[in-house]
């Protein structure tokens, strides 16, 4: 089971109209450049077999991957939104740094790995897709971690 007290984000993180709007605007701008609409990174398949109590830990993994492998390398694109949204997401990542689960997390890592593999397989268009799904990342963190 998760060490649940550490796998938590305060509700206030998701109640800031300005940064919420900027996150959603960034997602929209990137999704305009995404022509592979059949593939979804964040959705039902990502959560398959993962209990509600483990989902924040799952989303922490997705958030960290998105920051390190997608947003940092693409940080010069989609301005001015990127320069505001990346520090916001990095703060959320930092607040989840002590979120761990005790015991086997293989089922979670398997689901996260599928997402990573999809992004890598699609190359730059996979990175654009991940940015285009930042609204889903935001909602998933909100739903799983508050």
């Amino acid at each position: 089971a998760p060490i649940s007290s550490h796998c938590r984000l305060d509700k206030s993180n998701f109640q800031q109209p300005y940064i919420t709007n900027r996150t959603f605007m960034l997602a929209k701008e990137a999704s305009l450049a995404d022509n592979n609409t059949d593939v979804r990174l964040i959705g039902e398949k990502l959560f398959h077999g993962v209990s509600m109590s483990e989902r924040c830990y799952l989303m922490k993994q997705v958030l960290n991957f998105t920051l390190e492998e997608v947003l940092f390398p693409q940080s010069d694109r989609f301005q001015p939104y990127m320069q505001e949204v990346v520090p916001f997401l990095a703060r959320l990542s930092n607040r989840l740094s002590t979120c761990h689960i005790e015991g086997d997390d293989l089922h979670i890592q398997r689901n996260v790995q599928k997402l990573k593999d999809t992004v890598k397989k699609l190359g730059e268009s996979g990175e654009i897709k991940a940015i285009g799904e930042l609204d889903l990342l935001f909602m998933s963190l909100r739903n799983a971690c508050i």
Epitope: F24, K28, D38, V39, R40, G43, D135, L136, M139
Partner: antibody, heavy 119, light 107 residues
Framework: QVQLVQSGAEVKKPGASVKVSCKAS????????ISWVRQAPGQGLEWMGW????????NYAQKFQGRVTMTTDTSTSTAYMELRSLRSDDTAVYYC????????????WGQGTLVTVSS | DIQMTQSPSTLSASVGDRVTITCRAS??????LAWYQQKPGKAPKLLIY???SLASGVPSRFSGSGSGTEFTLTISSLQPDDFATYYC?????????FGGGTKVEIK
């Protein structure tokens, strides 16, 4: 092209059951789910529930809980909606619509199936 | 359940008019709102998703705006093909809910 084709019109007696089918083509069936939406004559749209074509997980509107069953057959890319204990106010056009069930709009709709409940 | 309130319920307009339909959610739904067009005897057709994104193949005279609880659908210059009923729908929370519809008729 991507499409959903539904079964034909049905006339049922009160208390009976009806099973409507929705055959998908032109896309990977298990990458999406199917929502069912109904529309009574001259009325608006009412969401009944959703089924994942990937896992078979369902989410029913409370109003229909216990009276509706949604299923899928991945071998034929077909979704089904069964409504039991029919009443006259269940007379409506029943639509299937494609959606992923996770923050997704209904981008493809079936043509609709008219179900008439009359004694 | 989230209630979706559409206004007006009926709208009389002429070809070439700019038409605006509003939709209000009973609680915040971020941008998880869709607009559909329905003609008599036909299935609804997706026009706008995520409050402001134009669905594939939809003419650019249709546009959507808003977030949170207040949303609008605008038709910049009404065409003969646009006389129909329009519905908003939230997909932020289950159960998914629709507005009551706005019928756009010829003046």
């Amino acid at each position: 092209q991507v499409q959903l084709v539904q079964s034909g019109a049905e006339v049922k007696k009160p208390g009976a059951s009806v099973k409507v089918s929705c055959k998908a083509s032109g896309y990977t069936f298990t990458s999406y789910g199917i929502s069912w939406v109904r529309q009574a004559p001259g009325q608006g749209l009412e969401w009944m529930g959703w089924i994942s074509a990937y896992t078979g997980n369902t989410n029913y509107a409370q109003k229909f809980q216990g009276r509706v069953t949604m299923t899928t057959d991945t071998s034929t890319s077909t979704a089904y909606m069964e409504l039991r204990s029919l009443r006259s106010d269940d007379t409506a056009v029943y639509y299937c619509a494609r959606d992923r069930g996770y923050y997704d709009a209904f981008d493809i709709w079936g043509q609709g199936t008219l179900v008439t409940v009359s004694s | 359940d989230i209630q979706m309130t559409q206004s007006p319920s009926t709208l009389s307009a002429s070809v070439g008019d700019r038409v605006t339909i509003t939709c209000r959610a009973s609680e915040g739904i971020y941008h998880w709102l869709a607009w559909y067009q329905q003609k008599p005897g036909k299935a609804p057709k997706l026009l706008i998703y995520k409050a402001s994104s134009l669905a594939s193949g939809v003419p650019s005279r249709f546009s959507g705006s808003g977030s949170g609880t207040e949303f609008t659908l605008t038709i910049s210059s009404l065409q003969p093909d646009d006389f129909a009923t329009y519905y908003c729908q939230q997909y932020s929370n289950y159960p998914l809910t629709f507005g009551g519809g706005t019928k756009v008729e010829i003046k």
